[in-house]
Interface confidence: low
């Protein structure tokens, strides 16, 4: 089932795990292009960011909620 899911997703015009512009992304999401831009990275290096790949998996695929007692509805 997972293989089919990823196969389908990989045929999308834009890979959903490549960008931070989806409903499941958080303010802490940063795209790899931004991470690799040294001048940008220097100004924000004090902040912890997550990658769109991680957020795609943990927030869209796994649909993590804020806690076991706060079920999500992603």
């Amino acid at each position: 089932a997972w293989a089919t899911y990823y196969l389908f997703q990989s045929f999308q015009k834009e890979l959903p795990w490549a960008h931070c512009n989806h409903s499941w992304n958080t303010p802490h999401c940063m795209e790899d292009t931004m991470r690799k831009n040294k001048s940008v990275w220097i100004t924000i290096s004090s902040t912890n960011f997550t990658s769109p790949v991680i957020e795609f998996w943990e927030r869209n695929v796994l649909s993590l909620s804020p806690g076991i007692d706060h079920p999500g509805s992603l």
Epitope: S23, P27, N48, P66
Partner: antibody
Amino acid sequence: QVKLQQSGAELMKPGASVKISCKATGYTFSRYWIEWVKQRPGHGLEWIGEILPGSGSTNYNEKFKGKATFTADTSSNTAYMQLSSLTSEDSAVYYCARGGFLGHYGFAYWGQGTLVTVSA
Amino acid sequence: DIQLTQSPTTMAASPGEKITITCSASSSISSNYLHWYQQKPGFSPKLLIYRTSNLASGVPARFSGSGSGTSYSLTIGTMEAEDVATYYCQQGSSIPYTFGGGTKLEIK
């Protein structure tokens, strides 16, 4: 269950510094952002900033840069906020809260608040 | 910074009455990052609704939320005495996260 226990009320002199603690229990402390919020009577709620205990990473509201400093001790599951150069404007109730895993579902759990009074 | 403006600032309602509180954002935010809190006098804020319309654990079904873009609202289907509190909206869309000024709800 998740619980955030804050340190007790503080009466401070102008110019002094104060360090507030927030002890977390009932979840994996390192994986969730700890948020800090200020509340003054008639001023509503103000977000000061946040710290991710696992990495020590921080985000500050520009307004509180130089005023607040966040630290976290993962061995004791405790987050700290130090407020420096205190003035009467810093008299308020300060809350710690737990942010969502990897982002924002709102602040689902709150400490009981720490009252800081600055008076000569 | 994104400013959140709540209205009304204060209001009084009779038991059983339907209440609507609005929250207007200075710029568009994703509905995934708009939350509501309830704060009773002398207590910490409590998460009421997260991601615009999801009820937090233990929150009665008479509470509901809706909205998108710059306009959001919190509705209490039938006001009860225990709903006397101050209600705040909050955005987690961009740093710094901000709260609305609050709506103080009283009972007639």
